[in-house]
């Protein structure tokens, strides 16, 4: 089944879901509850909660993976994830968005057999919504002592979009607060009018701003925000690429 | 189905303080700004603040800074609005709403001595 | 802050009359929102982006405008459409109202 609300439900109707290995009585994976599983088309509003689930057993217990559009589903193939809960043979997706939208295949399998189910997930758009940040950008840069560089954040919100730089810096030799949440700096924000705040420039660099740059974006919906990580090297060093990282900006300076 | 819901009417003395709540549910909680309006009797409606849940973040209306805080618990989905050294111009109706679409059904303050 | 001034303050039509009031901002903004409100309830959620018809809201109503100047009209007047309509904008902080238009029935 598939709920469409903002807390994961406890599923407290699980006696069949999670049946125990019996060494005598191997047998290839099951369905132990069809009926969770007839509704196969689930068109849900953006930014509700989808669970599929696929209840089974087998012997051994069977392993449950997830395939979306026919192919593996990586966590990283959704902003925030998404949960397996393999007791309960559930995969949920929190803040449904668009690009959720697809065939999820749940695949069951043990050395015996393996069994599928297709569900399909329509996500009925609810705008305005959220600001949504191009994947990839900030891109992290490297550069040398007295370079220059340049970060981008491209921003798509259909409604008025607030956007700050902000960085991590440190307070009196500390880069955490008395809480433990690291103090940030905003470096640049957006007016009404503001124009060109999805850049940030940045001259002459010395060793001093290498670090983490948070891209963060407001509407009157909600947030979002990425990051990258400027590296500065010594002016004989040649600038090198870095793997991206996000974070979550915490601790407002 | 998406809902908020307010507590219930609130009489408070001048110079009192009040804690209402809004308890949510049927939406992703963390991941939407909670506003708080205010519409004293007869009048037009005023934004008092926002509170994003996921980090804590708040905006709010500086007529409205030192008279509210907004607060929010995730656990609980339920955002909750302070407001301290209340006079007779507190007396309203004060709504939280998310994404604009959604709004609770209002909590009644009466200050009367 | 951003004033926003809805005019008339109070107006009234007979059922199948074309409605139009206005907003007036004091900046240039990106998008107006319209709600309704009718007495004992909670303002309703009419319009959003300045003409983006919200869930369930019937399609005599509708919005547009851009910069300083907005409009709310309503096709066909109906008398379950009299109530209390404000404007609103979510574009610079603090977020403002318009005083409203009382809308009342012939």
């Known amino acids: 089944d598939a709920i469409s609300s903002g807390d994961d439900e406890d599923d407290t109707d699980s006696s069949e879901d999670f049946v125990s290995e019996n060494r005598s009585n191997q047998r290839a994976p099951y369905w132990t509850n069809t009926e969770k599983m007839e509704k196969r088309l689930h068109a849900v509003p953006a930014a509700n909660t989808v669970k599929f689930r696929c209840p089974a057993g087998g012997n051994p217990t069977p392993t449950m993976r997830w395939l979306k559009n026919g192919k593996e589903f990586k966590q990283e193939h959704r902003i925030g994830g998404y949960k397996v809960r393999n007791q309960h043979w559930s995969l949920i997706m929190e803040s449904v968005v668009p690009s959720d939208k697809g065939n999820y295949t749940c695949l069951v399998e043990n050395e015996y057999g393996s069994i599928n189910h297709t569900y399909h997930l329509d996500v009925v758009e609810r705008s305005p919504h959220r600001p949504i940040l191009q994947a990839g950008l900030p891109a992290n840069a490297s550069t040398v002592v007295g370079g220059d560089v340049e970060f981008v954040c491209k921003v798509y919100s259909d409604a008025q979009p607030h956007i700050q730089w902000i960085k991590h810096v440190e307070k009196n030799g500390s880069k955490y607060g008395p809480d433990g949440l690291p103090y940030l700096k905003v470096l640049k924000h957006s007016g009404i009018n503001s124009s060109n705040a999805e850049v940030l420039a940045l001259f002459n660099v010395t060793e001093m701003d290498a670090g983490e740059y948070i891209c963060k974006v407001s509407n009157y919906i909600g947030q979002a925000n990425q990051s990258a990580w400027l590296t500065v090297l010594p002016k004989q060093q040649a600038p090198v690429r870095e793997k991206e990282i996000t974070a979550s900006p915490d601790y407002l300076e | 189905e998406v809902q908020l819901h307010q507590s219930g009417t609130v009489l408070a003395r001048p110079g009192a303080s009040v804690k209402m709540s809004c308890k949510t549910s049927g939406y992703t909680f963390t991941n939407y700004w909670m506003h708080w309006i205010k519409q004293r009797p007869g009048q037009g409606l005023e934004w008092i603040g926002a509170?994003?849940?996921?980090?804590?973040?708040?905006n709010y209306n500086q007529k409205f800074k030192g008279k509210a805080k907004l607060t929010a618990v995730t656990s609980a989905s339920t955002a909750y609005m302070d407001l301290s050294s209340l006079t007779n111009e507190d007396s309203a109706v004060y709504y939280c709403?998310?994404?604009?679409?959604?709004w609770g059904q209002g909590t009644t303050l009466t200050v009367s001595s | 802050q951003i004033v926003l001034t809805q005019s008339p303050a109070i107006m009234s039509a007979s059922p199948g009359e074309k409605v139009t009031m206005t907003c007036s901002a004091s900046s240039g903004l990106s998008y107006m929102s319209w709600y309704q409100q009718k007495p004992g309830s909670s303002p309703r959620l009419l319009i959003y982006d300045t003409s983006n018809l919200a869930s369930g809201v019937p399609v005599r109503f509708s919005g547009s405008g851009s910069g300083t100047s907005y409009s709310l009209t309503i096709s066909r007047m109906e008398a379950e459409d009299a109530a209390t309509y404000y404007c609103?904008?979510?574009?610079?902080?603090?977020?403002?109202f318009g005083g409203g238009t009382k809308l009342e029935i012939k």
């Open positions: 509170i994003y849940p996921e980090n804590g973040d708040i």
């Open positions: 709403t998310s994404r604009g679409d959604y």
């Open positions: 609103q904008q979510w574009s610079s902080y603090p977020y403002t």
